[in-house]
Interface confidence: low
């Protein structure tokens, strides 16, 4: 039985040209993660696996660095960046777990966070 | 069972074109690197091609220009087009899943396709 | 030429310990992983390690790799005769960006 519960940095915003750190944290379960994969709708963003670390897909190594811990940031912004992002928690024995995170990114120079997390 | 099966081999004039397939079973094909991996009559293994999934490419530098790597993630299927073919791409053609991603090794291969150039 | 250098032979008794090495520069086997994959006469390659010393399930754990700087080896203990193979390291090239095999080392069980 699945128990344990994702919590995330919710519906978020940021300005045009900035940056933004995605965050999933899993709780409420002993099971082991064994691998992270960060996705934007259906793209494969980045993968943070258990024993072998971090990889960053081709098309995205440019604006996307890994961390802080299993969170992703992600930089230099544009509006196309708008949208939902998943965290895909692969966990043993449990199975998988999902996060969503909605990010908007604006052209405003004002920018809230709406965050379960505080966002540097 | 996660199983690789490569097709579509055989014997080819010199500049000559090849289409190879390799259909994928038993895992989730879209959310891992491919490649093509060849071995010529008695020698070493040599990486020929990559496709990531978000369609990224990498080919070694013996087959740029001339080969073509793709995929039909609808059809779970590899494909590697093999155009202006010459003696030295006489081999064994293997299909290999990556262990996640491709820079973490290749888990899973085909039992291979063998390509002959030759007049 | 392989970018990856092996030693073409290797050999030991069964029972032994062996290690097969494989040497490469900083852009591939310094900034990247390392695997092994043992190929039998006529079959397919197998992969053996992943992640410079990770085993997948079904490989016995008298197969070992390590990595320091440069270079990479491939450890089998406790030799056997089925071990007699040809075995190649492989890894990402950073400079190249491509994937690259040492030569390959053929193991003799005397």
């Known amino acids: 039985m699945m128990t344990g519960t994702i919590e995330t940095t919710g519906n978020i915003s940021a300005e045009k040209g900035g940056s933004i750190i995605l965050q999933c944290h899993l709780s409420s379960t002993t099971a082991q993660v064994t691998q992270v994969n960060w996705e934007q709708q259906d793209q494969l963003l980045a993968i943070c696996n258990a024993d072998l670390g971090w990889h960053i897909s081709p098309s995205f190594k440019d604006r996307v660095a890994p961390g802080p811990g299993l969170g992703l940031t992600l930089q230099s912004l544009t509006v196309n960046d708008t949208g939902e992002y998943f965290c895909i928690y692969h966990t043993y024995p449990d199975g998988t777990y999902t996060g969503r995170i909605f990010l908007e990114v604006l052209e405003s120079s004002v920018a809230e966070h709406g965050a379960r997390f505080q966002i540097p | 069972e996660v199983q690789l099966l490569e097709s579509g081999g055989g014997l080819v004039q010199p500049g000559g074109s090849l289409r190879l397939s390799c259909a994928a079973s038993?895992?989730?094909?879209?959310?891992?690197?491919m490649s093509w991996v060849r071995q010529a009559p008695g020698k070493g293994l040599e990486w020929v091609s990559a496709?990531?999934?978000?369609?990224?490419?990498y080919d070694a530098d013996s087959v740029k220009g001339r080969f073509t790597i793709s995929r039909d993630n609808s059809k779970n299927t590899l494909y590697l087009q093999m155009n202006s073919l010459r003696d030295e791409d006489t081999a064994v053609y293997y299909c290999?899943?990556?262990?996640?991603?491709?820079?973490?090794?290749?888990?899973?291969w085909g039992q291979g396709t063998t390509v002959t150039v030759s007049s | 030429q392989s970018v990856l250098t092996q030693p073409p032979s290797a050999s030991g008794t069964p029972g032994q310990r062996v290690t097969i090495s494989c040497s490469g520069v900083?852009?591939?086997?310094?900034?990247?992983?390392v695997s092994w994959y043992q190929q039998l006469p006529g079959t397919a390659p197998k992969l053996l390690i992943y992640?410079?010393?990770q085993r997948p399930s079904g490989v016995p754990d008298r197969f070992s790799g390590s990595k320091s700087g440069t270079s990479a080896s491939l450890a089998i203990s406790g030799l056997q005769s089925e071990d007699e193979a040809d075995y190649y390291c492989?890894?990402?090239?950073?400079?190249?960006?491509?994937?690259?095999f040492g030569g390959g080392t053929k193991l003799t069980v005397l």
């Open positions: 038993g895992f989730t094909f879209s959310s891992y690197a």
């Open positions: 496709i990531y999934f978000d369609g990224s490419i």
């Open positions: 290999a899943k990556s262990h996640t991603v491709l820079q973490y090794g290749m888990d899973v």
């Open positions: 992640g410079n010393d």
């Open positions: 492989g890894t990402w090239d950073n400079t190249l960006n491509a994937w690259v």
């Open positions: 900083t852009s591939n086997i310094r900034n990247s992983y």
